[in-house]
C-alpha cells in the first residue's frame, strides 16, 4: 500500500491544527448509514487532505471519505456498529491525526418533522404533535425530544420541555393570551446509542386566543 506527498507539503501540514469532529446517522437512507466529518478550524487548507476510516467495517478494512466542499462523508451499509473505528486525516499515506471512535456514540438523529399545534377549546390547552423517521428504524428507535417554544417577541426567552413521546400538551393558562408563539423540536439518542442533538425541525407558529372578559378565560 503506498501513496505520496511532497515533503514541503508535509512540513506545512504539521504546522496546522487538524482537529475534527464527526457524527453518524444510522439508516439515514433506507438501510444505508452515513458518517460525516469536518475540521473544527474552517480555515484549514484541505486541498490534499483525505479522511479514512479503518476497522469495525464489513467487507473492507478501510474506506475513504468523499469530499463535498468542506465536509467529508461516507454513505454505506458496511459499518459493523460494534467496536471502535479509527478515523484519520491523511496526506497520501501519512496520518496527520487520528481518533478512535465507536460510531454508536456519535449518532445525530434526523430532525423531527410535521410539527403542528392544535388548540382544544373545551380542554383549554394546546396539543403539540410531531413525527420522527426514527419510529420506523431498526437501530436508533428511542429518542429524547426537546420541544422549545417562545413568544415571538421574546427573541431569546425559550421554554424547553423534554419528552420521550411525540405528543405534548401545553396548558392555555401557562401561555400569554392573544400572542404569537413559535415552537420547534429536536431529538437526541436516549437508549444504548449516544450522540448529539439533531437539527431543529422547521418552526411552527400559532396564536393564542384572546381573554374572554366575562369569564376571564381566553377565547
Amino acid at each position: 500500500e503506498s501513496g505520496y506527498a511532497q515533503n514541503g507539503d508535509l512540513e506545512d501540514a504539521e504546522l496546522d491544527d487538524y482537529s475534527f469532529s464527526c457524527y453518524s446517522q444510522l439508516e439515514v437512507n433506507g438501510s444505508q448509514h452515513s458518517l460525516t466529518c469536518a475540521f473544527e478550524d474552517p480555515d484549514v487548507n484541505t486541498t490534499n487532505l483525505e479522511f479514512e476510516i479503518c476497522g469495525a467495517l464489513v467487507e473492507v478494512k478501510c474506506l475513504n471519505f468523499r469530499k463535498l466542499q468542506e465536509i467529508y462523508f461516507i454513505e454505506t451499509k458496511k459499518f459493523l456498529l460494534i467496536g471502535k473505528s479509527n478515523i484519520c486525516v491523511k496526506v497520501g499515506e501519512k496520518s496527520l491525526t487520528c481518533k478512535k471512535i465507536d460510531l454508536t456514540t456519535i449518532v445525530k438523529p434526523e430532525a423531527p418533522f410535521d410539527l403542528s399545534v392544535i388548540y382544544r377549546e373545551g380542554a383549554n390547552d394546546f396539543v403539540v404533535t410531531f413525527n420522527t423517521s426514527h419510529l420506523q428504524k431498526k437501530y436508533v428507535k428511542v429518542l429524547m425530544h426537546d420541544v422549545a417554544y417562545r413568544q415571538e417577541k421574546d427573541e431569546n426567552k425559550w421554554t424547553h420541555v423534554n419528552l420521550s413521546s411525540t405528543k405534548l400538551t401545553l396548558l392555555q393558562r401557562k401561555l400569554q393570551p392573544a400572542a404569537m408563539y413559535e415552537i420547534k423540536v429536536r431529538s437526541i439518542p436516549d437508549h444504548y446509542f449516544k450522540g448529539f442533538w439533531s437539527e431543529w425541525s422547521p418552526s411552527y407558529y400559532f396564536r393564542t386566543p384572546e381573554i374572554n372578559n366575562s369569564s376571564g378565560e381566553m377565547d
Partner: antibody
Framework: QVQLVESGGGLVKPGGSLRLSCAVS????????MAWIRQAPGKGLEWVST????????YYPDSVKGRFTISRDNAKNSLYLQMNSLRAEDTAVYYC???????????????WGQGTLVTVSS | DIQMTQSPSSLSASVGDRVTITCRTS??????LAWYQQKPGKAPKLLVY???TLHIGVPSRFSGSGSGTDYTLTISSLQPEDFATYFC?????????FGGGTKVEIK
C-alpha cells in the same frame, strides 16, 4: 453506456518503459477508484495498481512497487499506467477496470476494458 | 498479505450438473469477496460480490456463500454458456488478490 478502452501496449525490451492509457466514457471518472489488472498468457489474474477517486492515494503490490506508477486525468477522462524497468514476467494483457461502487474504495470490478497486450522480450 | 487458495483448479461436468467452487483465504476477509467468470480472449465478468450478492443481470442459477475464510460459488444447474474459467477475488485489504482460477470443462 460505460466504456473503457486501453491502448499503448506493444513489444518492449527488458529494462524498457511503456505507458498504457485507458480512455473512459459513459460515467464520471472523478467519482470512481480505478485499477489496472493483468493476466499473463494462459495464467490467472493479477492486480497491478489502484488509484483513489481523488487521485491522492495510490496502491501497488510488491511485484511492481517502485517500477509502475498509476495516474489519472479526470478532465481528459483518462487513466494511465507508467511502466519502467520492465521484466519478462511483466508480459501480460493489461486491463483497466472500474469498481461497481462509486467513491470510498470497494474494489470489485463490474466494467473492464478489452485489454492491451504488453510483451517484454529481447 | 492475504493468500487465496481456489479449488479445484479444473473440473469436468455435464449440462444440468450442480457445480461448486471454493475459495479459502489466509485470514478473515469479512465477506469482502467477489467471483468472476472469464471466457477465452475476453475480459472477466463480475458475478457475485459481498460474498453472496448476485450482480445485476447474472442468472439466478449462480449463487455465492460463505464467511470468515471459506467461500463458495455454486452453479445449481450448469448451462452450455457456463463453461468458462472462474476466479475469486478478495477486496478486504490491499494488496487485492485473485484465486488461481477454476476451469469448468465439458465432460
Amino acid at each position: 453506456q460505460v466504456q473503457l478502452v486501453e491502448s499503448g501496449g506493444g513489444l518492449v525490451k527488458p529494462g524498457g518503459s511503456l505507458r498504457l492509457s485507458c480512455a473512459v466514457s459513459g460515467f464520471t471518472l472523478s467519482d470512481y477508484y480505478m485499477a489496472w489488472i493483468r493476466q499473463a498468457p494462459g495464467k490467472g489474474l493479477e492486480w497491478v495498481s489502484t488509484i483513489s477517486a481523488s487521485g491522492l492515494r495510490t496502491y501497488y503490490p510488491d511485484s511492481v512497487k517502485g517500477r509502475f506508477t498509476i495516474s489519472r486525468d479526470n478532465a481528459k477522462n483518462s487513466l494511465y499506467l507508467q511502466m519502467n524497468s520492465l521484466r519478462a514476467e511483466d508480459t501480460a494483457v493489461y486491463y483497466c477496470a472500474r469498481p461497481l461502487s462509486a467513491h470510498y474504495g470497494f474494489n470489485y470490478f463490474d466494467y473492464w476494458g478489452q485489454g492491451t497486450l504488453v510483451t517484454v522480450s529481447s | 498479505d492475504i493468500q487465496m487458495t481456489q479449488s479445484p483448479s479444473s473440473l469436468s461436468a455435464s449440462v444440468g450438473d450442480r457445480v461448486t467452487i471454493t475459495c479459502r483465504t489466509s485470514e478473515d476477509i469479512y465477506q469482502g469477496l467477489a467471483w468472476y467468470q472469464q471466457k477465452p480472449g475476453k475480459a472477466p465478468k463480475l458475478l457475485v460480490y459481498s460474498a453472496n450478492t448476485l450482480h445485476i443481470g447474472v442468472p439466478s442459477r449462480f449463487s455465492g456463500s460463505g464467511s470468515g475464510t471459506d467461500y463458495t460459488l455454486t452453479i445449481s444447474s450448469l448451462q452450455p454458456e457456463d463453461f468458462a474459467t472462474y476466479f475469486c477475488q478478495q477486496y478486504y485489504d490491499y494488496p487485492l488478490a485473485f484465486g488461481g482460477g477454476t476451469k469448468v470443462e465439458i465432460k
